[in-house]
């Protein structure tokens, strides 16, 4: 009987094969007079048509790479395995779906770099004397979920400008604090101070070197910071093979992107590095601070896991942040930073705890849905992410894919990936939209009333100005 | 195609200037209309950036523009035993015009500051100040409204209340149709912000060459606040007129404060005693809603609408993935008392960090549907992030969701194309409101003109057979 | 050149107010960043520092003494002064003042000769 | 407050020999460190301040170094008149604070 194949009045097997997935094309020259060549398969072959001769791709997925999840992360790093399978191709015809799946696990005793920023303005002064013998007593408690730890410290303040910076009388340029009768260092954007080092004692000195500044106003420039921090990978350096975390400590707002304004600063953030061989953010001073947009993006493509450390003050502020910059943790810093070492070891225990997969570069006519397979074998529908876990623990995720009508292109890449691993699947897809009777098309043929058009898969397509089966 | 996309006009400042951070049309007193053009970045005469003000004669092959002659040399004054001093360098004169009647405001809201005192000082601080000009008769004077006196001491003892140091004055202004020169000062009393408000006339009729701190006597300013949802707003940032009370005798005041309530940002409309009558509510944090405000009547009821731009509004995309793209939110203005409530009408930009929302400048009626019609700048949207403008045309629901014609950037990317937009004006005396376009980047403003509409009517005869 | 001498009553009952002064010559207390303050030292004991007086008339004090201290200047006599309330003999000392110049940061650049104090009824 | 200790508080040594006090903080003070020479019959004289800067008109013989909590005052080749009371004091925050002292006596 009648189906959605023979009743779209379709005259060619590609038109045929985006109906539904569920149609066939007989390109058989033998058809029975009157048989739709487009039909469901099983109907096609009740007509007689040879198998051969019928058109009928079917969406599939391939597991190109699949090496072994790793049960350690430490050895060769370069090595460690936390997403499987690495590599897939998936096949599909218009308007078709097909599932793969993706395991994720947070291997233990993987290495962890964690960069701290921290915000030097004038009322951290307490905070500084807190953190001077930070380094060893973190690598003390980290020791517990990582052998490979290395850490490193940056400082921020705001854009040396006014009206951030006290510009009078002179002596304010050098020290801040002259009004006060007391010293502060001179205002500075943001400083790289201590690259990232398994030598943690060099985190307690260099930390006992540092002095607070002062500027005018509440909001600091923390996001150019961060920012920085997460762009100038070699100066920072961040492992490839690492987890990441960058600790941004404050006990006051922050300026965003457009603020510069004020200071007569318009140039957008770029989002490159400019950090010289000074260590300084030459660039604080001519462009503006960085969206939330560019920040995000910045950070997942390192894999950078923020962790906001912030004072009870700002807390709920730095909490709204991070809802719009996914994979960022928000943890409440004492007034004078004495609970930091708990918060880091805290905010570590959080992000292993939850895998959250993120879609790079998705082409716009290919839908995700998601099924999760968390903790106790429990299937949970449209979930992307699993929370409580335990480091170790794996986890799988079933993805189906869909793909809307026939895109232009006909190979396109995307990949999935946790929120802050390196590790990823990439997807590499090839939308079947064509015949394979199409290649062996004849032009100008004479089964076309004598070369009125090409004769392809079974039936004439006619030139221009001719028309009729035959193109007669 | 209303704005002639091909025959365009461009004019262009010295290199690095801004040209085209801000512009107006300026009418002078025979009708002539000029462009009006701030670089806020041009060198001074001892070669520093004091930033300029370029009015551009109306020609359609365009071409250079002579600037307007300003005092662009620091001051200083002894006044008993108190130094007044006034610094110029990176004042950015031009960061916002206005003109009015035949007079041209154009302000320099970096302008520095400092009162000496014995061992005290005020504090060198970018107060801002306007500088006004009458181009035929050649008057000049300034309004400066945060200057002051005080000493850095008594403020720390007062706990910075009452702080205007740090104002910015002429960040952005506006000129009623009055006469009242409006200016938003963003870091007005220790960065709340804060509107001040002094008639051009008595601007002109107090002012002295050389006093450096005189009184507007009437002049007024916005208050002081307590309340921490105003602290670090940006109260000025963005500022316009319009009728919001159902008084035709009185003038309301729009003012953006991107910042407000911890970044969720807010627009408030305010009566001339600046009491508050309404605030609209940014939707989201950090994106900057009220960093531009615009006022026209779209749908033709005869009141005044709002348009609000939100520049970094992140919108959810597949995969709940965030894309900063920017939104522009239109709050039609009910009939009676009621407040202006939700937006009747979200137009968000389309392109990755294009800061669509970035300007909106009412068009006028650009179609001649009856319907009045405005522009949207995303100075970084459009092919390679070149900055686009969007056109969208009014209707009796108020703006048609689509535009119905983009304009892309002539010039290379980085030029900021639509960083500022003024239209609503006939520059070429046919009939139809003309749109300039500044791209600070390239320093260029460009000027698009709108052409006649051709209105096709069409009658079917069916004739017995 | 820059001097500074400090000059007391030598002996003063307990309870009583200890007044102090400093006069100086060489610098002006009118130029900025200049402050001059008071430290003392107690037989055989370290230094400790009281309070100090900057040329803006701002005042700083040991938290520990504050209750106790006033700091102020005659800057047309180049001089400045400080009070000890309700003294006892834990204020027996040498009392010196000194001068403070701002270069970068703040420190005593020039100190003046001891006023020794005795305590005693 | 920040506590200064300071070591040794005695030390005997010969002219033309090095030697060196040492100054700790109870706290992080960056560079901000000065040190003072008191004589018998004069009054206290400042040498270094900033951690390592040395006044105008001190020898070069006296040399300052450290940063954040240990510092020390370095003199080399002692003269004569070197042998004094040596105090160190932090400058950069309130209530400034002096070390307890170090008497230098010849050996």
């Known amino acids: 009987g009648p189906n959605i194949c023979t009743t779209r009045g379709v005259s060619s097997c590609q038109q045929c094969l985006a109906v539904s997935p569920m149609c066939a094309w007989c390109s058989d020259e033998a058809l029975p007079l009157g048989s739709p060549r487009c039909d469901l398969k099983e109907n096609l072959l009740k007509d007689n048509c040879a198998p051969e001769s019928i058109e009928f791709p079917v969406s599939e997925a391939r597991v190109l790479e699949d090496r072994p999840l790793s049960d350690k992360g430490s050895g060769d790093s370069s090595q460690v395995t936390q997403v499987s399978p690495q590599r897939i191709a998936l096949r599909l015809r218009p308007d078709d779906s097909k599932n793969f799946s993706i395991q994720v696990r947070q291997v233990e005793d993987y290495p962890v770099d964690i960069y701290y920023l921290m915000d030097l303005s004038y009322s951290m002064k307490d905070d500084l004397w807190s953190i001077q013998n930070l380094g060893t007593k973190l690598a003390t408690q980290m020791r517990k979920l990582t052998s490979n730890l290395r850490i490193g410290f940056g400082a921020f303040v705001d854009k040396p400008v006014s009206p951030y910076m006290y510009i009078s009388p002179p002596e304010a340029l050098e020290n801040p604090c002259y009004d006060m009768k007391t010293t502060c260092l001179p205002m500075f954007g943001y400083k790289h101070v201590l690259t990232l080092t398994d030598q943690v004692t060099r985190f307690n000195e260099e930390v006992k070197k540092q002095s607070v500044s002062r500027n005018r106003d509440a909001p600091e420039g923390g996001f150019d910071a961060i920012m920085q921090a997460t762009v100038c990978d070699e100066k920072i350096g961040w492992r490839n093979d690492a987890s990441h975390l960058l600790v941004f400590t404050t006990d006051a707002k922050t300026h965003i992107a457009l603020d510069g304004r004020l200071a007569g600063i318009v140039q957008p953030n770029d989002g490159q590095c400019h950090v010289g061989s000074d260590n300084h953010y030459s660039a604080s001073t001519t462009m503006d601070y960085p969206s939330l947009g560019l920040m995000t993006e910045k950070l997942s493509q390192k894999n950078i896991n923020l962790i906001f450390a912030v004072t009870e003050n700002v807390v709920n502020l730095y909490q709204n942040y991070s809802e719009l910059i996914p994979g960022t943790t928000v943890g409440v810093l004492s007034m004078d930073s004495s609970n930091v070492l708990q918060l880091i070891v805290d905010a570590y225990g959080k992000i292993r705890s939850k895998v959250e997969l993120e879609v790079r570069d998705l082409p716009e006519e290919l839908s995700l849905s998601f099924n999760a397979t968390c903790l106790n074998n429990e299937v949970i529908p449209g979930l992307k992410s699993c929370m409580g876990l335990k480091i170790g623990d794996t986890v799988s995720f079933s993805i189906e894919a869909k793909v809307r009508g026939c895109p232009q292109e006909k190979e396109k890449s995307f990949t999935i990936k946790p929120v802050g691993f390196k590790d990823s699947l990439i997807v590499q897809v090839t939308f079947d939209c064509d015949c394979a009777c199409q290649a062996q098309a004849e032009p100008n043929s004479h089964r076309c009333n004598n070369g009125n058009g090409t004769f392809e898969c079974g039936v004439c397509r006619c030139g221009p100005g001719w028309l009729g089966s035959q193109c007669e | 195609l209303n704005l002639d996309p091909v025959q365009l006009t461009f004019y262009a400042g010295p290199n690095g200037s801004q040209f085209g951070f801000s512009l107006d049309f300026h009418k002078d007193s025979h009708g002539r209309v000029a462009i009006v053009v701030g670089a806020p970045r041009t060198l001074g005469p001892s070669q520093e950036e004091t930033g300029g003000v370029f009015l551009c004669p109306w020609r359609a092959e365009g071409g250079q523009c002579p600037s307007l002659l300003f005092d662009l040399r620091d001051e200083t004054r002894n006044v008993g035993s108190q130094t007044l001093q006034t610094f110029k360098a990176r004042q950015g004169l031009g960061a916002s015009v206005v003109s009015w009647s035949d007079v041209i405001v154009a302000c320099a809201p970096w302008q520095h500051w400092n009162v000496l005192e014995k061992t005290e000082e005020a504090e060198k601080t970018p107060v801002g100040s306007c500088f006004l000009a009458q181009p035929e008769s050649g008057r000049r004077a300034e309004y400066s409204p945060c200057r002051g006196n005080t000493l850095s001491r008594i403020y720390v003892e007062n706990d910075f209340s009452w702080d205007k140091r740090y104002c910015e004055a002429g960040f952005s202004s506006v000129v009623t149709q009055a006469g009242e020169l409006v200016l938003g000062a963003p870091g007005g009393y220790y960065f709340l912000g804060l509107l001040a408000q002094a008639p051009v006339a008595d601007i002109f009729s107090s002012y002295r060459p050389g006093i450096l701190l005189w009184h507007v006597s009437s002049q007024s300013l916005s208050f002081d606040s307590s309340n921490p949802e105003y602290f670090d707003g940006y109260w000025g940032y963005s500022v316009a007129v319009g009728e919001f009370d159902g008084d035709l005798n009185t003038t309301e005041y729009v003012v953006g404060a991107p910042t407000w309530s911890w970044t969720l940002g807010a627009v408030e409309i305010l009566d001339s005693y600046y009491q508050r009558l309404h605030r609209l509510r940014g939707e989201q944090m950090a994106s900057y809603f009220g960093h531009s405000v615009a006022v026209t009547d779209v749908n033709g009821d005869g009141r005044h609408d709002l348009l609000v731009g939100a520049p970094l509004y992140m919108e959810s995309r597949a995969d709940r993935k965030l894309a900063e793209v920017g939104r522009v939110y239109l709050f039609l203005q009910p009939r009676g008392p009621h407040a202006l409530g939700a937006p009747s009408l979200l137009l968000t930009g389309t392109q990755l960090y294009g800061r669509f929302g970035s300007a909106i400048a009412p068009l006028g009626d650009l179609d001649r549907d009856g319907y009045n019609d405005i522009a949207v700048a995303a100075p970084y949207g459009g092919p390679s992030g070149r900055g686009q403008v969007l056109v969208f045309l009014g209707q009796s629901e108020g703006l048609r969701s689509r535009p119905s014609q983009v304009l892309d950037s002539p010039f290379p990317t980085g030029s900021a194309f639509g960083f500022s937009l003024r239209g609503a004006v006939d520059i070429d005396d046919n009939g139809y409101p003309d749109l300039i376009v500044g791209a600070y980047g390239a320093n260029q403003v460009a000027v698009y003109r709108a052409q006649p509409v051709v209105k096709a009517s069409v009658q079917l005869l069916v004739q017995d057979s | 050149q820059v001097t500074l001498k400090a000059s007391g009553p030598g002996i003063v009952q307990p309870s009583q107010t200890l007044s102090l002064t400093c006069s100086f010559s060489?610098?002006?207390?009118?130029?900025?960043?200049?402050?001059v303050g008071w430290i003392r030292q107690p037989s055989g004991k370290g230094l400790e520092w009281l309070a100090h007086i900057w040329w803006d008339d701002d005042k700083r004090y040991n938290p520990a003494l504050k209750s106790r201290l006033t700091i102020s200047k005659d800057t047309s006599n180049n001089q400045i002064f400080l009070k000890i309330a309700s003294v006892d003999t834990a204020d027996t000392a040498t009392y010196y003042c000194?001068?403070?110049?701002?270069?970068?940061?703040?420190?005593?650049?020039?100190w003046g000769q001891g006023t020794t104090l005795t305590v005693s009824s | 407050d920040v506590q200064i200790t300071q070591s040794p508080s005695y030390l005997a040594a010969s002219p033309g020999e090095t030697i060196t006090i040492n100054c700790r903080a109870s706290k992080s003070i960056s560079k901000y460190l000065a040190w003072y020479q008191e004589k018998p019959g004069t009054t206290y004289k400042l040498l270094i301040y900033s951690g390592s800067t040395l006044q105008s008109g001190i020898p070069s013989r006296f040399s300052g170094s450290g940063s954040g909590t240990d510092f020390t005052l370095t003199i080399s080749s002692l003269e004569p008149e070197d042998f004094a009371m040596y105090y160190c004091q932090q400058h950069i925050e309130y209530p400034w604070t002096f070390g307890g002292g170090t008497k230098l006596e010849i050996k």
């Open positions: 000194a001068r403070s110049h701002y270069y970068g940061t703040f420190y005593f650049d020039y």
């Open positions: 060489g610098f002006s207390l009118n130029t900025s960043g200049m402050g």
